[in-house]
Interface confidence: medium
């Protein structure tokens, strides 16, 4: 048995940050699971990890270097991603792993979102003139 | 000294509806994560549902998602289960617990209890 995971096709980061969630046919609830987010076609980059178990807090974390944080739902995992840079435009994947109780279980590959980071345009400040001289 | 008192258990038919209430005191009840659990006779402990200090975030186990409501009054340190379409294998004694991180983790107190029997 696999878990199937739903993502939106595509999110755009604004303001370098966005908000993806990753909705599970599974229920986590006092569950030891290991939710991650992966980037580019082959999963290569683990993005960010948000794990749960029985005896801590939930554990949310990045080890190549990007700016997350996540947040538990019923059936979903959802993960804030901030300070995203526009080179960092690529599809990004959920994946989750149950551990306990047994048997465990992993997902089926889902579509993927895309992530399009969007540059920060600066517009300059309106001009206002001085008073005006005869 | 933390104290947890349930109440509101009792007989019921299936299909039939209860309100549990637990009362809190000793700590500060509006900053803490709470939980009901269960334990039916002869089984382990059964995690039901949880809620957030604020009581915004709500969790549900599979097998009450839909028929149960967790609920919390801050102003009166009261800790609620709203339980409708009840069915047999409800049959439980009910516990409420402290709960100090998330959903997925154990409880630091729990109170004595409250049996609930569904049958006809």
């Known amino acids: 048995n696999k878990i199937l995971v739903k993502q939106s096709p595509m999110l755009v980061a604004y303001d370098n940050a966005v908000n993806l969630s990753c909705k599970y046919s599974y229920n986590l609830f006092s569950r030891e699971f290991r939710a991650s987010l992966h980037k580019g076609l082959d999963s290569a980059v683990e993005v960010c990890v948000v794990y749960g178990n029985y005896s801590q807090q939930l554990q949310v974390y990045s080890k190549t270097g990007f700016n997350c944080d996540g947040k538990l739902g019923n059936e979903s995992v959802t993960f804030y991603l901030q300070n995203l840079y526009v080179n960092q435009t690529d599809i990004y994947f959920c994946k989750i792993e149950v551990m306990y109780p047994p048997p465990y279980l992993d997902n089926e590959k889902s579509n993927g979102t895309i992530i399009h980071v969007k540059g920060k345009h600066l517009c300059p400040s309106p001009l206002f003139p001085g008073p005006s001289k005869p | 000294e933390v104290q947890l008192l349930e109440s509101g258990g009792g007989l019921v038919q299936p299909g039939g509806s209860l309100r549990l209430s637990c009362a809190a005191s000793g700590f500060t009840f509006d900053s803490a994560n709470m939980s009901w659990a269960r334990q039916a006779p002869g089984k382990g402990l059964e995690w039901v549902s949880w809620?957030?200090?604020?009581?915004?975030?709500?969790f549900y186990a599979d097998s009450v998602f839909g028929r149960f409501t967790i609920s919390r009054d801050n102003s009166k340190n009261t800790l609620y289960l709203q339980m409708n379409s009840l069915r047999a294998e409800d049959t439980a004694v009910y516990y409420c617990?402290?709960?100090?991180?998330?959903?997925?983790?154990?409880?630091?107190?729990r109170g004595q209890g409250t049996l609930v029997t569904v049958s006809s």
């Open positions: 617990a402290r709960s100090p991180f998330g959903p997925l983790y154990g409880f630091d107190y």
């Open positions: 809620i957030e200090a604020p009581g915004v975030q709500t």
